[in-house]
């Protein structure tokens, strides 16, 4: 799986989007979780509404949102008033039993409020190194990861 | 006029199976999930199970206590929903009511139900 | 799974009075809510949904408020007609309906 870059402006609110397979994935609830290190276990941080006919009711979890499309086959989170502690590795999953299928890899990153003229030297930026031409910076924009983009911090 | 009427209640051995059905008039079936609940004597309401409307291919869902026991389906052609009860036991005793769900739009619907049938009787006795 | 607390069980009141239920989730359910009207023998009625919202057609002494946990089915103004059972019915976690109060007339 590529890895999609979602960056969203703290204290905002971040929508995320992953598009899937809707025939695929008929019948089969979803969840949101966040990876726990990189070969870590992927800790579920919210998931769809029990009764599959009822997926498009936003569930929430704290400050993380959940519905799901099924019908056009698009999965969406929103996290609202993004933190820093926010960023990281996460996946859109599609589950089915004690099973679950990655719907998408999402690398979301917390960048600094322009209004908000505090220190703003807590705010991670995964692979800030790297070159982010690419990437039109806008509230929730998203774009795959660059190849040898580290989609987690370097551990001190 | 919008209408739901049961059919098919009645006294029936433990361990037997019956099929209610649910007739539906007065309004476009196929675009409405349709629910199945049930009323012990002098007790509360308990959902049953509901399917969904033609968009979302008539996938069903129940509650635990009858899950792998009854099975609800539905015709379009006929515009019934149907409830067979398979493996009764006497906790099934009930007034079953079949019921419509709210639909705000051909995807979204919520789980008010606005439009219940008379219900029919179910007793499970030996 | 989430228990719906219904209460009173039971009250007596005036033709007149303004009569009010509540209805406590045992976990957070938005405002996944609805309320219903049985009278003896006969089916259930949709009275509010969504917590706050009057379905067509009925009367306006009836309304629901309330988010989270807690949340209030209120009739401002007790008709005899309104003798009968209320229900509230939760959506967030599966289908469930709380124990259901009885309005009597005193």
């Known amino acids: 799986h590529n890895t999609t870059v979602f960056q969203g402006v703290a204290g905002q609110s971040l929508q995320v989007s992953c598009p899937y397979d809707s025939m695929k994935h008929w019948g089969r609830r979803k969840a949101w979780c966040r990876q726990l290190g990189e070969k870590g276990p992927c800790q579920r941080v919210v998931s769809t509404h029990n009764l599959w006919l009822l997926s498009f009711l936003r569930r929430w979890n704290g400050s993380t949102a959940i519905t799901d499309d099924t019908l056009g086959g698009t999965l969406t989170i929103t996290l609202r008033n993004l933190q820093p502690h926010d960023a990281g590795l996460y996946q859109c999953q599609s589950l089915h039993g004690s099973e679950a299928d990655t719907l998408r890899k999402v690398l979301v990153e917390v960048l600094a409020d322009p209004l908000d003229h505090r220190d703003a030297g807590d705010l991670w930026f995964p692979g800030e190194s790297e070159s982010f031409e690419d990437a039109h910076v806008e509230h929730s924009i998203s774009r795959s990861l660059l190849e040898g983009e580290i989609p987690f911090p370097p551990t001190s | 006029e919008v209408q739901l009427v049961e059919s098919g209640g009645g006294l029936v051995q433990p361990g037997r199976s019956l099929r209610l059905s649910c007739t539906a008039s007065?309004?476009?079936?196929?675009?409405?999930?349709m629910s199945w609940f049930r009323q012990a004597p002098g007790k509360g309401l308990e959902w049953v199970g509901f399917i969904g409307s033609k968009a979302y291919s008539a996938t069903t869902e129940y509650t635990a206590s009858v899950k792998g026991r009854f099975t609800i389906s539905r015709d379009g052609s006929k515009s019934i929903a149907y409830l067979q009860m398979n493996s009764l036991k006497t906790e099934d005793t009930a007034v079953y009511y079949c019921?419509?769900?709210?639909?705000?739009?051909?995807?979204?619907?919520?789980?008010?139900?606005?439009?219940w049938g008379q219900g029919t009787m179910v007793t499970v006795s030996s | 799974d989430i228990q719906m607390t219904q209460s009173p069980s039971s009250l007596s009141a005036s033709v007149g009075d303004r009569v009010t239920i509540t209805c406590q989730a045992s976990?957070?359910?938005?405002?996944?809510l609805n309320w219903y009207q049985q009278k003896p023998g006969k089916a259930p009625k949709l009275l509010i949904y969504?917590?706050?919202n009057l379905e067509t057609g009925v009367p306006s002494r009836f309304s629901g408020s309330g988010s989270g946990t807690d949340f209030t089915f209120t009739i401002s103004s007790l008709q005899p007609e309104d003798i009968a059972t209320y229900y509230c019915q939760e959506y967030d976690s599966y289908i469930t309906f709380g124990g259901g109060t009885k309005v009597e007339i005193k």
């Open positions: 976990q957070d359910i938005t405002n996944y």
């Open positions: 969504d917590a706050s």
């Open positions: 007065g309004f476009t079936f196929d675009d409405y999930t």
């Open positions: 019921a419509r769900g709210k639909r705000y739009s051909y995807t979204y619907w919520t789980p008010a139900f606005d439009v």
